[in-house]
């Protein structure tokens, strides 16, 4: 905290400039007013005030706005913007995305801060939903956004906001995170031809049932090992080696190499030795020939 | 990685000269607007001068008319020529891109003006 001292003569601010950053903390304490700070604070981002310098700034809007500050001058806050802690900005109302891509852009480049989550927090709580503008912002700044949400927090994302989701931005999701966007996915891009609808899907296909993917095993996609692996285990599990076949198309070979992993290794179990066999890869494991199955799991649904 | 190394202090009587040399490697240094900072024992840090990329200068009211602050960008040097030294100049000097916003951090070459 700076101390109280009078302002010398001659120094009392009359305007936000660049004769500031001569001032001493003490100095910019005494001799800045803080109402002339907030109505000129589109002045302040441009001035390159040492990051001391911005503490007493803030210090002086912190005294000006006890209660939190306006929009008016957070949108205009800048660099002065990485000197807020979380509980400053659980006090602001932040409503314009404008104001959210300012501030977004001060922290470009590094990553997500607790104080950006709590501003991105209080943003989409205060549009009551993540629309498909905030979305395009928000992983256009930071692509691993979309994972660090809930299931909880993504069940209010819009299936029209599901455009705007990239690839790379579910690289980080788990299972549950897609369990909650791929029926949106689906939702999204239910109007589009096979080929284009798969390009689309095929990131979000890790929350897919096993009936859909039977489905798509029906469309000669192609699907890559990577996505496959991806795949939900349960999902997985109820497809007969024909329809996997069909699934990956040529890059059925790679299932070899990938033979002792999830969910390939627990699919494999599950199939009849002499069904993998046909592939010609040499999987081993399946059930031997002569074999019943019984599904346990039915048999206790109908009792 | 940006580097910035200071030279040129020394101790020196009132009313004596001393230049400041700082070098600059790892950014484009005639796009860079370049600052002196300075921070006297048991004070805080204080601008003294600036360079703008387009050669226009700024001075602390403390050093105006003393001071002057230069720049070769071939070297990827800026200089703060030192006259009339007074004992209130004593104190580490340190130079910064305006941008990193920084101030008085790292090493900076000390100055100490005795009577």
């Known amino acids: 905290e700076v101390e109280k001292t009078a302002c010398p003569s001659g120094k009392k601010a009359r305007e936000i400039d660049e004769s500031l950053i001569f001032y001493k903390k003490w100095e910019l304490e005494a001799c800045v007013d803080a109402a002339l700070l907030a109505t000129q604070m589109d002045r302040v981002n441009a001035i390159p005030f040492t990051y001391e310098q911005l503490d007493v700034l803030k210090h002086k809007l912190d005294e000006l706005y006890p209660q939190g500050y306006p929009e008016s001058v957070i949108q205009h806050l800048g660099y002065l913007f990485l000197k807020m802690s979380p509980e400053d900005i659980r006090k602001w109302n932040v409503t314009s995305l404008e104001t959210l891509k300012a501030l977004l852009e001060v922290n470009k480049g590094h990553e997500m801060s607790p104080q950006v989550a709590t501003l991105i927090d209080r943003f989409v709580k205060g549009r009551g939903q993540l629309d498909k503008d905030t979305l395009d912002t928000l992983t256009a700044f930071y692509p691993g956004y979309l994972c660090s949400l809930s299931p909880e927090e993504l069940s209010s994302v819009p299936p029209s906001s599901i455009w705007a989701v990239r690839p790379q931005d579910l690289d980080t999701c788990d299972p549950r995170q897609l369990d909650v966007l791929y029926p949106k996915a689906r939702l999204a891009f239910q109007n589009m031809n096979g080929s284009e609808y798969f390009v689309k899907i095929q990131s979000f296909l890790g929350g897919a049932p096993t009936e859909d993917l039977k489905a798509l095993s029906q469309q000669n996609v192609s699907m890559d090992l990577a996505t496959f692996m991806k795949l939900r285990t349960d999902a997985v599990l109820p497809l007969t080696v024909a329809e996997v076949q069909k699934l990956l198309g040529p890059h059925v070979e790679g299932l070899k190499a990938e033979e002792r992993h999830r969910p390939v290794r627990d699919w494999i179990l599950r199939q009849r030795q002499d069904d993998l066999d046909t592939l010609g890869l040499g999987l081993q494991g399946g059930i031997p020939n002569g074999y019943l199955v019984l599904d346990l799991s039915m048999q206790e649904a109908l009792s | 990685e940006v580097q910035l190394v200071e030279s040129g202090g020394g101790s020196v009587q009132v009313g004596e000269t001393l230049r400041l040399s700082c070098t600059a490697s790892g950014f484009t240094f005639d796009d860079s607007d370049m600052g002196w900072y300075r921070q006297a024992p048991g004070d805080e840090c204080e601008l003294v001068s600036t360079?703008?990329?387009?050669?226009?200068?700024n001075y602390a009211d403390s050093v105006k008319g003393r001071f002057t602050i230069s720049q070769d960008n071939a070297k990827n040097t800026v200089y703060l020529q030192m006259t009339s030294l007074k004992p209130e100049d004593t104190a580490i000097y340190s130079c910064?891109?305006?941008?990193?916003?920084?101030?008085?951090w790292g090493q900076g070459t000390l100055v100490t003006v005795s009577s």
């Open positions: 360079i703008s990329s387009d050669g226009s200068t």
């Open positions: 910064r891109t305006m941008a990193s916003r920084i101030g008085c």
